[in-house]
Interface confidence: low
């Protein structure tokens, strides 16, 4: 008799999830000398232990603590780039500006980027059919709790000037319900962080409005100011030119507004 399986609203665990996590770990530790001491099998075991045999709606930050401990990593606290709804450009930027880091440039972020995973209560199986959707099913699911945990730790580590890249083509440029808006903003440490600088990325060449005056940006400014952190904002009108000028800052066209 086939065993009844819980049907969730979200996509199932990414195919070949264990192999992917292990391969990414090996690749990361090869590229980053400071993480060569990491035992990737232990990392996978800790990752697996966070969600296997547990109800996928009852995951807690404590479940991920063994993994957090193994993935402890020091990044320059004044070189942190947060992002919201504009991951690709943020990653392109840190690939060029190698001394800056997004969460996905850290080991734990790199391991989980774009992956989905969940298990089943009381079985050692990984559920490849479906996983809980944050809205439709439950928020305390393995993926959401992971990102909440690593995002909180990443924000807590930040110091001096923290940058955040925001998508000017979204209906809400700053969204209080995003990971940035609900987790990272509230975990920046005022005693360490002097300024949050937002970079609002414009979506069209023909768009020259000042999106730093957007109501949602004003809302972000208000939240940040109340936390005794200074706020500044820049429009990035031409993201393509912006990246080009990061690559070639001496280019004569890079003195004008991007």
């Amino acid at each position: 008799v086939p065993r009844w399986r819980q049907q969730w609203s979200g996509p199932g665990t990414t195919k070949r999830f264990p192999e992917t996590v292990l391969a990414r770990c090996v690749k990361y530790t090869e590229i980053h000398p400071e993480m060569r001491h990491v035992d990737c099998q232990s990392v996978w075991d800790a990752f697996k232990g966070a969600f296997i045999s547990k109800h996928p709606c009852n995951i807690t930050e404590e479940d991920y603590q063994p993994l957090m401990k193994l993935g402890t990593q020091t990044v320059p606290c004044n070189k942190i780039l947060l992002w919201s709804r504009i991951k690709d450009l943020a990653h392109q930027f840190t690939q060029v500006q190698r001394d800056m880091f997004t969460l996905e440039d850290t080991l734990l972020g790199y391991l989980a980027d774009d992956l989905t995973w969940c298990g089943e209560f009381n079985t050692s199986k990984i559920n490849y059919q479906s996983c809980p959707d944050w809205r439709k099913d439950c928020s305390n699911n393995p993926v959401s709790v992971f990102w909440k945990t690593v995002s909180r730790r990443f924000a807590e580590a930040a110091c001096d000037v923290v940058h955040v890249m925001l998508n000017g083509s979204r209906s809400k440029i700053f969204d209080k319900n995003s990971t940035f808006g609900s987790v990272e903003v509230h975990n920046l440490q005022p005693e360490k962080v002097q300024t949050l600088e937002a970079w609002v990325i414009h979506g069209g060449r023909e768009d020259s409005r000042d999106l730093c005056q957007d109501p949602t940006i004003k809302e972000l400014e208000s939240i940040i100011s109340k936390r005794n952190i200074q706020f500044s904002c820049k429009n990035i009108y031409r993201p393509d030119k912006f990246l080009q000028c990061v690559k070639n800052p001496e280019d004569s066209s890079c003195t004008s507004e991007i």
Partner: antibody
Amino acid sequence: QLQLQESGPGLVKPSETLSLTCTVSGGSISSSDYYWGWIRQPPGKGLEWIGSIYYSGSTYYNPSLKSRVTISVDTSKNQFSLKLSSVTAADTAVYYCARGQYSSGWYAYPFDMWGQGTMVTVSS
Amino acid sequence: EIVLTQSPGTLSLSPGERATLSCRASQSVRSSYLAWYQQKPGQAPRLLIYGASSRATGIPDRFSGSGSGTDFTLTISRLEPEDFAVYYCQQEANVYTFGGGTKVEIK
């Protein structure tokens, strides 16, 4: 029901400054959901955007008029104003104030509510 | 500055007929930044379409907008007597510019 009403002199002498006020009733000018603009229409011709203002005071001007235009907002009076300096006969037009729904990013909503317009003639 | 060119300048049609108005931009305009207005003599313009194809509140479904890039169209499927007016397209990517207008008159 929100209404916009333009007011100001109907006749302005050349080289002087044209001053108009738009009074908003039935709603708050301080709402973050809207921005406010001025558009003009010379007799028998098409529409020309002059500039816009957000309740916070952020302004956006038509570059062809920018050197002569000032738009300001007075939230306590629920009004916003237009000043156009060094006017000539070419500035003779019906001047409209209008409201735009403000949405960040993807949709830049156009002007969904207009005043009835006020005719301004530039003549000595 | 993006220039919008409307054609034809005048459209002579009878009630019940279909009207097709064109608006061409001098450079590509994101469709979400294109709007259409109707203006009757002695009145302020009225918003018909925003985002190239979304009808504004209270606008009858005989009005529809389409297009992308540099070519946009306003269609009135069956002209009613109250539809005879001047129609303007507008882009709002940076400097808000209006087209020169198309007058829809009774044939």
